[in-house]
């Protein structure tokens, strides 16, 4: 069964820009990836980007760029005003949902401050599985 990982990284030189990296470990066919966040704007979940293997990517503010990093991982770059970034991100959780075949949906979430850039094999902070 594949495991989803999430990594959130702040840019060292630019506090208003950071990126969410996520992927699936193991052998599975990816049919859709959705990256979202919770607690950023309101209590609900905000969709940041959707990446389809064939039809490309779609993103919504504050996501600036979404792309595939490898055949089984994606990256979403977010940009916002510095003051808004500091105040909004404290309670924000980023989630990645991978729809894979034959395993169904796999979700992992991570908040900004639990991400350790030096971690070599991040374990998902939350791994919800819905087959």
């Amino acid at each position: 069964s594949p495991e989803v990982w999430v990594q959130v990284q702040m840019e060292a030189t630019n506090l208003s820009s950071f990126s969410v990296h996520c992927g699936v470990l193991g052998y599975s066919l990816i049919s859709l990836v959705t990256v979202s966040c919770e607690g950023f704007v309101d209590a609900g979940r905000t969709k940041l980007a959707v990446l389809h293997p064939e039809f490309g990517t779609q993103q919504w503010a504050p996501a600036r760029q979404a792309h595939w990093e490898t055949p089984n991982s994606v990256s979403v770059t977010l940009t916002m005003g510095q003051s808004k970034a500091r105040s909004s991100l404290a309670n924000t959780t980023f989630c990645c949902e991978f729809v894979t075949f034959p395993h169904g949906s796999r979700v992992a979430c991570r908040d900004l401050h639990r991400s350790d850039p030096g971690l070599s094999a991040p374990t998902p902070a939350l791994n919800l599985q819905a087959d």
Epitope: Q7, H21, G23, L25, Y27, P53, H67, T70, P71, P122
Partner: antibody, heavy 123, light 106 residues
Framework: QVQLVQSGAEVKKPGSSVKVSCKAS????????ISWVRQAPGQGLEWMGG????????NYAQKFQGRVTITADESTSTAYMELSSLRSEDTAVYYC????????????????WGQGTLVTVSS | DIQMTQSPSSLSASVGDRVTITCRAS??????LNWYQQKPGKAPKLLIY???SLQSGVPSRFSGSGSGTDFTLTISSLQPEDFATYYC????????FGGGTKVEIK
């Protein structure tokens, strides 16, 4: 133009480990995955696994799971592949290659490649 | 795992010949297929990516086609420098290479 330069040839004893390095120069290192591919003498190409330096996350081919560890050091733009519990069948040329792709779709390919590192396992 | 089967495993041809190499995937891989050329003692070199896109700097005599499970690499007019081994590679689920096709001088 990105170039990948690998460490030199190694001779190892069965049961030991080998660590091969792959240094990138002339381009962005962190945001591109680096894969490792091996080729036994007179044989075909075999993907072992790869790593995205910016996140430090590695993915491995099932065959090598548990025996190979791929790491990356962003500060030196270097990727490493360590293979443990070596046996004679691991005698091969080991290549690193950059996963290059379109980004907006899932099309990826290997370009460029390192020059290769010959690892000989012999008692 | 996705298995990639190349045929033939070797072939003999003359300069100027039209050469066709096929690659079959064990399941549909859409157009997630690449072709590489390798010469003895050298690293592989990318020729074709995404089934039919010619890599920059590669001569136009090389072309790729196919989607799903069946793919073809064609060399329209074989040149002396084309004698080498050719590999297909799928990039749909992780990566797998075909067994290779050695193109030799007749």
């Amino acid at each position: 133009q990105v170039q990948l330069v690998q460490s030199g040839a190694e001779v190892k004893k069965p049961g030991s480990s080998v660590k091969v390095s792959c240094k990138a120069s002339g381009g962005t290192f962190s945001s591109y995955a680096i894969s490792w591919v091996r080729q036994a003498p007179g044989q075909g190409l075999e993907w072992m696994g790869g790593i995205i330096p910016i996140s430090g996350t590695a993915n491995y081919a099932q065959k090598f799971q548990g025996r190979v560890t791929i790491t990356a050091d962003e500060s030196t733009s270097t990727a490493y592949m360590e293979l443990s519990s070596l046996r004679s069948e691991d005698t091969a040329v080991y290549y690193c290659a950059r996963d290059t792709g379109r980004g907006y779709t899932r099309h990826f390919w290997f370009d460029p490649w390192g020059q290769g590192t010959l690892v000989t396992v012999s008692s | 795992d996705i298995q990639m089967t190349q045929s033939p495993s070797s072939l003999s041809a003359s300069v100027g010949d039209r050469v066709t190499i096929t690659c079959r995937a064990s399941q549909s891989i859409s157009s997630y297929l690449n072709w590489y050329q390798q010469k003895p003692g050298k690293a592989p070199k990318l020729l074709i990516y995404a089934a039919s896109s010619l890599q920059s700097g590669v001569p136009s005599r090389f072309s790729g086609s196919g989607s799903g499970t069946d793919f073809t690499l064609t060399i329209s007019s074989l040149q002396p420098e084309d004698f080498a081994t050719y590999y297909c590679q799928q990039s749909d689920i992780l990566y797998t290479f075909g067994g290779g096709t050695k193109v030799e001088i007749k």
